[in-house]
């Protein structure tokens, strides 16, 4: 594949990454799959600067990111190390709350109305953000 040099239509470029902001809601797994089908991944927040950029674009709306602990440890979908990486949880979060009555705890992370993170039930239909890196090889064949 060829190296992607500019963002697809309707995607926003920022710091050598492209971002797509949904305007509808999906469960976390469906949002994750949507991004993968776009040769991207749910957004991985690696810095305060990136946090502010995403926050500016999503506004005060619950929005999924690419962070979950469905199999135990917290993991970013692109393999970025959670332990040493950037974190922006709300106070008292994550709490893996079981009191919602939906079964299980809270295994998927989202931006809250103030931008800070919360863990929530992965089935909730929140908006989402896809991200892809400009420097990574595209799956599309090169133009001849």
């Amino acid at each position: 594949g060829s190296e992607r040099t500019c963002c697809p239509v309707n995607w926003v470029e920022h710091e050598r990454s492209c971002y797509w902001f949904s305007r509808s809601g999906k469960a976390w797994a469906d949002a994750d799959n949507y991004c993968r089908l776009e040769d991207a991944h749910l957004v991985v927040v690696t810095s305060w600067e990136e946090q502010k950029f995403v926050q500016h674009h999503i506004g005060p709306v619950n929005t999924w990111m690419g962070l979950h602990d469905q199999n135990g440890p917290w993991k970013w979908v692109d393999g970025t190390d959670y332990e040493t990486g950037f974190k922006n949880w709300r106070p008292e979060q994550p709490d893996d709350w079981y009191g919602h009555g939906l079964g299980g705890g809270e295994d998927c992370a989202h931006f809250t109305d103030d931008g800070r993170w919360n863990d929530d039930v992965c089935q909730r239909p929140y908006r989402w953000v896809c991200e892809t890196e400009l420097d990574k090889a595209s799956q599309e064949p090169p133009l001849l």
Partner: antibody, heavy 115, light 107 residues
Framework: EVQLLESGGGLVQPGGSLRLSCAAS????????MSWVRQGPGKGLEWVSA????????YYADSVKGRFTISRDNSKNTLYLQMNSLRAEDTAVYYC????????WGQGTLVTVSS | DIQMTQSPSSLSASVGDRVTITCRAS??????LAWFQQKPGKAPKSLIS???SLRSGVPSNFSGSGSGTDFTLTISSLQPEDFATYYC?????????FGPGTKVDFK
Amino acid sequence: EVQLLESGGGLVQPGGSLRLSCAASGFSFSSYVMSWVRQGPGKGLEWVSAISGSGDRTYYADSVKGRFTISRDNSKNTLYLQMNSLRAEDTAVYYCARTATKDYWGQGTLVTVSS
Amino acid sequence: DIQMTQSPSSLSASVGDRVTITCRASQVISNYLAWFQQKPGKAPKSLISAASSLRSGVPSNFSGSGSGTDFTLTISSLQPEDFATYYCQQYHSYPFTFGPGTKVDFK
């Protein structure tokens, strides 16, 4: 590397108290629910208690409710289990474990309640 | 509270055998089920979470299936190191509860 090390077990008389500790390392402690699970001699596993990452939510098995208190000190990366009014049936190896799916366990500490 | 039952309580098998252990919940727990392996004198080891998701480092001869109330742990080809006691656990709601265990020993 994730490590969980329990301590504080020992022999105690019925009605007595004991405080177990679990020192955690190798991960972002405050991001995880922590649990205590016990296993009586020759018995199966019994979930005892859990606490949210920040410590604001606690959960207990009916068998220990009102007698045991789970807590944590995130500044010290340590989980605690205060056990009061101990009974013979509380005799067990007590394990500390990370998360609902128990992806990491300590090696356990033995609590013996006997006169 | 949700009660968990396991069958059989024990079984004898040989290396290379296919082994199936079943776990049943007293109410619907979706896929909030984990499986553990424990050897004498050792802490339990997590094998599977979310009913069928194999934990990192667990051999592929282990598999889990099921949803709702009925679940299965399958060992496709029993290895010498697989002789142990196996427990299921629901984490649908507190208090979490374990099954009574299934001991797999040498035939």
